[in-house]
């Protein structure tokens, strides 16, 4: 079974580019990293740092989640990250997204031995 | 580089007191949620109390409720376990742990104190 780490990185990591290679990258990513498997996925964010620096976020600014959780942290510095956003015209199995590239700070829910992202919460 | 600091166990009588303390350094911002862990000799951890950074929410364990009491100085880093009416069944290494959930879960909280023994005689 897929651990809730490795499941983020699957979802979310994407240290390979420093940023979206093109208007088509969502589109091509969301398929490849199977998040258009069972149905469009809405709303995704990749995350272009290394793995390294993202898992340092759990040691970083401590703010509550969107859900109300309190193991959520907030990165000390802006990252490159990839927002795909379903598109109106995206229907099952033929998922469209639009892509936007941006640098933001990301919040991420940690949890575990070792504490690492197990979810990614939002970007501000 | 984050470091959180125990302080105040000891060896004590059953019926007895003790005082933990706490305090995190190397942080620059405030832990929402501060508790306290302990481990018995070949037991696994658990969860004894935790408290949010303004005061307002505690959990504790059913096992220590009416007999600890979790305390923080508000906003700050700091988190304290006042143990009193103590057992010889609350022997055990006492963690002090920072930036978890409120469900006293230790799989949420990432930071971690070395651990302080605390040791109730008969």
């Known amino acids: 079974k897929e651990t809730a780490a490795a499941k983020f990185e699957r979802q979310h990591m994407d240290s390979s580019t420093s940023a979206a290679s093109s208007s088509n990258y969502c589109n091509q990513m969301m398929k490849s990293r199977n998040l258009t498997k069972d149905r469009c996925k809405p709303v995704n964010t990749f995350v272009h740092e290394s793995l390294a620096d993202v898992q340092a976020v759990c040691s970083q600014k401590n703010v509550a989640c969107k859900n109300g959780q309190t193991n959520c942290y907030q990165s000390y510095s802006t990252m490159s990250i990839t927002d795909c956003r379903e598109t109106g015209s995206s229907k099952y199995p033929n998922c469209a997204y639009k892509t936007t590239q941006a640098n933001k700070h990301i919040i991420v829910a940690c949890e575990g031995n070792p504490y690492v992202p197990v979810h990614f919460d939002a970007s501000v | 580089q984050v470091q959180l600091v125990e302080s105040g166990g000891g060896l004590v009588q059953a019926g007895g007191s003790l005082r933990l303390s706490c305090a995190a350094s190397?942080?620059?911002?405030?832990?929402?949620?501060m508790g306290w862990f302990r481990q018995a000799p070949g037991k696994e951890r658990e969860g004894v109390a935790a408290?949010?950074?303004?005061?307002?929410?505690?959990l504790y364990a059913d096992s220590v409720k009416g007999r600890f009491t979790i305390s923080r100085d508000k906003g700050k880093n700091t988190v304290y376990l006042q143990m009193d009416s103590l057992k010889p069944e609350d022997t055990a290494t006492y963690y002090c742990?920072?930036?978890?959930?409120?469900?006293?879960?230790?799989?949420?909280?990432?930071?971690w104190g070395q651990g302080t023994q605390v040791t109730v005689s008969s």
């Open positions: 742990a920072a930036g978890g959930g409120y469900e006293l879960r230790d799989r949420t909280y990432g930071q």
């Open positions: 190397g942080y620059a911002y405030t832990y929402i949620y």
């Open positions: 408290m949010d950074s303004g005061g307002g929410g505690t």
